[in-house]
């Protein structure tokens, strides 16, 4: 929301989760064989085919780059539940081993478990909606959004204690991620720092900030998983 | 279990200071706001000022604004309020509660201004 | 300043009756309204935030309702205990006020 087209292929690690052919949730590639999204993005997946997309700018439009991936094994975080916003994430087995180019490449994650500092710059980007009508875009958007200290972002007016030690907020004055960007990656500096988080939430709410997963805080999970 | 525990009753003079201190426990400091609010005796609630232990920052109530003073040692996990030129119509029971999640309020301390 | 009026200033009623306490805020406060209880010589204790919301361990019989300048605090039926000076705060604007108390007697 409020965000504008990201430059195509820039940010390879850019996976769009899907249920039976259609985009679905964002997801980040963390190895060559395992995606990181958020647990909720699953919840009413029951039947349905669940692939992942990396390589892509456009969902809809040919590109050398984009390829399918069948889903090998689905690993929700064993604490996740459907109505909690708490360690809201997901890891998926790809059927094969992804192939890399300058296109597809895991992103480095956050290994130390040490706060953002609040103000930072964080890359988010996705496919969720753009604007408040609902319009999906085709292509990857992204958006830059300041970390904000958890202490404001607890306030009665924001979340309300809700941002546990193991959660970060981001500014969401307009611009912010929103429906359809969940499980996507929040970025600082290069480096993985969080996950959309996937609960239902008014975007582009200056009192409503964005939630994500702290990555660093799940770290020997992730490792546990990919080991 | 989450606890706001405050310093003991004061007696102070007319024009001097008081600083009343707040420990928290039972969760991460920096993570909430602590306000301040008092209750002259027999009177309803006043809000004083709020800070926010992470950044430092504070908000007041314009009728506090020039005398009131909030603080936090985040080594400690401790919040104070220092209120200095003090009158008789200060004396009242001042409480720091945490601002988000749970409504955690201090026991309360009495501040008697007298001379 | 955001003015909040409550209404009455107290009451008396039987164990077992409803009461009813309204807060009119100055200025749309949204559903920023919390509702607190105090008794003698004891720190206010949370019931009811965002203007519905009970706080856990509140029990089912106080509600809260409204949004904008209107709020309304309801005790399905009162207990013994219930007995005390109950406050509406709002936390939508600087500085953050509270109405002025409502003293709920024994008839």
């Known amino acids: 929301l409020g965000g504008r087209e990201a430059e195509a292929h820039a940010r390879p690690y850019m996976a769009s989760v899907q249920l039976n052919g259609a985009h679905l949730c964002g997801g980040v590639l963390v190895a060559e064989q395992w995606v990181l999204s958020a647990a909720h993005c699953l919840e009413d997946a029951a039947d349905g085919k669940v692939q992942v997309l990396l390589g892509a700018h456009s969902l809809s439009q040919p590109e050398p780059s984009k390829r399918l991936y069948d889903v090998l094994r689905a690993v929700p975080h064993p604490d996740s539940q459907p109505d909690t916003i708490d360690h809201d994430l997901l890891l998926l087995q790809l059927s094969e081993k992804a192939t890399l180019g300058p296109a597809v490449r895991p992103l480095p994650w956050q290994r130390v478990d040490r706060d953002v500092a609040p103000g930072t710059l964080c890359d988010v980007a996705g496919w969720g909606i753009v604007n408040h009508a609902g319009r999906r875009p085709d292509s990857l958007q992204h958006v830059l959004l300041p970390v904000l200290d958890r202490a404001t972002c607890n306030r009665r007016t924001h979340h309300d204690g809700a941002i546990t030690e193991r959660l970060m907020c981001a500014e969401s004055n307009r611009r912010d991620s929103c429906k359809g960007d969940s499980g996507g990656p929040l970025v600082c500096g290069g480096v993985l720092e969080g996950v959309v988080t996937s609960g239902s939430r008014v975007c582009g709410n200056r009192k409503k900030p964005g939630i994500y997963t702290r990555v660093a805080s799940y770290a020997a999970w992730i490792d546990s998983v990919l080991a | 279990e989450v606890q706001l525990v405050q310093s003991g009753a004061e007696v102070k003079k007319p024009g001097a200071s008081v600083k009343v201190s707040c420990k928290a426990s039972g969760y991460t400091f920096t993570s909430y706001y602590m306000y301040w609010v008092r209750q002259a005796p027999g009177q309803g609630l006043e809000w004083i000022g709020e800070i926010n232990p992470y950044s430092g920052g504070t908000n007041f109530n314009e009728k506090f604004k020039s005398r009131a003073t909030l603080t936090v040692d985040t080594s400690t996990s401790t919040a104070y309020l220092e209120l200095s030129s003090l009158r008789s119509e200060d004396t009242a029971v001042y409480y720091c509660?945490?601002?988000?999640?749970?409504?955690?309020w201090g026991q309360g301390t009495l501040v008697t201004v007298s001379s | 300043d955001i003015q909040m009026t409550q209404s009455p200033s107290s009451l008396s009623a039987s164990v077992g009756d409803r009461v009813t306490i309204t807060c009119k805020a100055s200025?749309?406060?949204?559903?920023?309204v919390a509702w607190f209880q105090q008794k003698p010589g004891k720190a206010p204790k949370g019931l009811i935030y965002?203007?519905?919301s009970r706080y856990s361990g509140v029990p089912s019989r106080f509600s809260g309702s409204g949004s904008g300048t209107d709020f309304t605090l309801t005790i399905s039926s009162l207990q013994p205990e219930d007995f005390a000076t109950y406050y509406c705060q709002q936390y939508n604007n600087y500085p953050l006020t509270f109405g002025q108390g409502t003293k709920v007697e024994i008839k």
């Open positions: 965002s203007a519905s």
């Open positions: 200025q749309n406060v949204d559903t920023d």
């Open positions: 509660a945490r601002e988000g999640g749970f409504a955690y």
